[in-house]
């Protein structure tokens, strides 16, 4: 599932490049392992912002699929309460390219620990 999430992220990146969306998004660029589920939640919430701002059907479908995949991969630990983690709004705001790069990085963290 996580490998498919990465391919969806690359698809979103390709779609966005042709659209010139210049939104800034809350981005966790240095994820601590004990906060990775919280960080994933922030990434997914921000991804929905991209979908809404783009108004593009392909981006919408890909984001929705990515959320479904992530949900299923995290169904066992998605409700784990992680303490001492930053709220989404406390994270740095970065451009979409940097946001997606950081997103791929956190997904790789999940791949490495699964």
């Amino acid at each position: 599932n996580w490998v498919n999430v990465i391919s969806d992220l690359k698809k979103i990146e390709d779609l966005i490049q042709s659209m010139h969306i210049d939104a800034t998004l809350y981005t966790e660029s240095d994820v601590h392992p004990s906060c990775k589920v919280t960080a994933m939640k922030c990434f997914l919430l921000e991804l929905q912002v991209i979908s809404l701002e783009s108004g593009d059907a392909s981006i919408h479908d890909t984001v929705e699929n990515l959320i479904i995949l992530a949900n299923n991969s995290l169904s066992s630990n998605g409700n784990v309460t992680e303490s001492g983690c930053k709220e989404c709004e406390e994270l740095e705001e970065k451009n979409i390219k940097e946001f997606l790069q950081s997103f791929v990085h956190i997904v790789q963290m999940f791949i490495n620990t699964s």
Epitope: V37, K41, L44, A57, D61, E64, N65, I67, A70, N79
Partner: antibody
């Protein structure tokens, strides 16, 4: 008023194939994900499949995965369910349903068609 | 897979009286983004299912306000404040937080 009309049901032998259709009208079909849900005679509801708005993403339970294929033709406002290698336990009324977006709404099936009966028997 | 268990399976109610149906999931159905995709559907005799409640407590358009949904995590409830004759049918809870999406077995509401 949203309209969904399922058709294509009938009697088929075990191991046979059938293609169901669902004609949609009175809404912008391409703006919605769609699902199939079935109900065996006298039994409860079972989710069968969901397809994304553009048709790129499809989802199935293990009970039909590899045998059933959901697809759509947005130019014809039509949803399909191709059913292969049919078994007696696939006998059911099949309903098509419109899905509200996960991102903009509640991810629920807000409108349902009237259903078409599929009977698998020799 | 998430198993949805409803109770009771049969619910005889006097007209004008309240009714309550419970639905319990085998694991939490709160998704990673914090949403709980739990719906309630009504199926009247001989009819297609109809959406009543989505995301636990949101009433769908046109649904009478005597229907209400509540709950969180793994325990959910559908309440009908005053049962009317047209409420007869089978009620299903449904989770679509995690694939495969799953229905409860259904609760048959009948008039005493």
């Amino acid at each position: 008023e949203v309209r969904l009309m399922a058709s294509g049901g009938g009697l088929v032998q075990p191991g046979g194939s059938l293609r169901l259709s669902c004609a949609a009208s009175e809404f912008t079909f391409s703006n919605y994900a769609m699902s199939w849900v079935r109900q065996a005679p006298g039994k409860g509801l079972e989710w069968v499949s969901t397809i994304s708005r553009g048709g790129d993403y499809t989802y199935y339970p293990d009970s039909v995965k590899g045998r059933f294929t959901i697809s759509r033709d947005n130019s014809k406002n039509t949803l399909y369910l191709q059913m292969n290698s049919l078994r007696a336990e696939d006998t059911a009324v099949y309903y098509c349903a419109r899905r509200v977006s996960m991102i903009t709404g509640g991810w629920a099936m807000d409108y349902w068609g009237q259903g078409t009966l599929v009977t698998v028997s020799s | 897979d998430v198993v949805m268990t409803q109770s009771p399976l049969s619910l005889p109610v006097t007209l004008g009286q309240p009714a309550s149906i419970s639905c319990r999931s085998s694991q939490s159905i709160v998704d990673i983004t914090g949403n709980t995709y739990l719906e309630w559907y009504q199926q009247r005799p001989g009819q297609s299912p109809r959406l009543l409640i989505y995301k636990v407590f949101n009433r769908f358009s046109g649904v009478p306000d005597r229907f209400s949904g509540s709950g969180s995590g793994t325990d959910f409830t559908l309440k009908i404040s005053r049962v009317e004759a047209e409420d007869v049918g089978v009620y299903y809870c449904f989770q679509d937080s995690f694939v495969p999406y799953t229905f409860g077995q259904g609760t048959k509401l009948e008039i005493k």
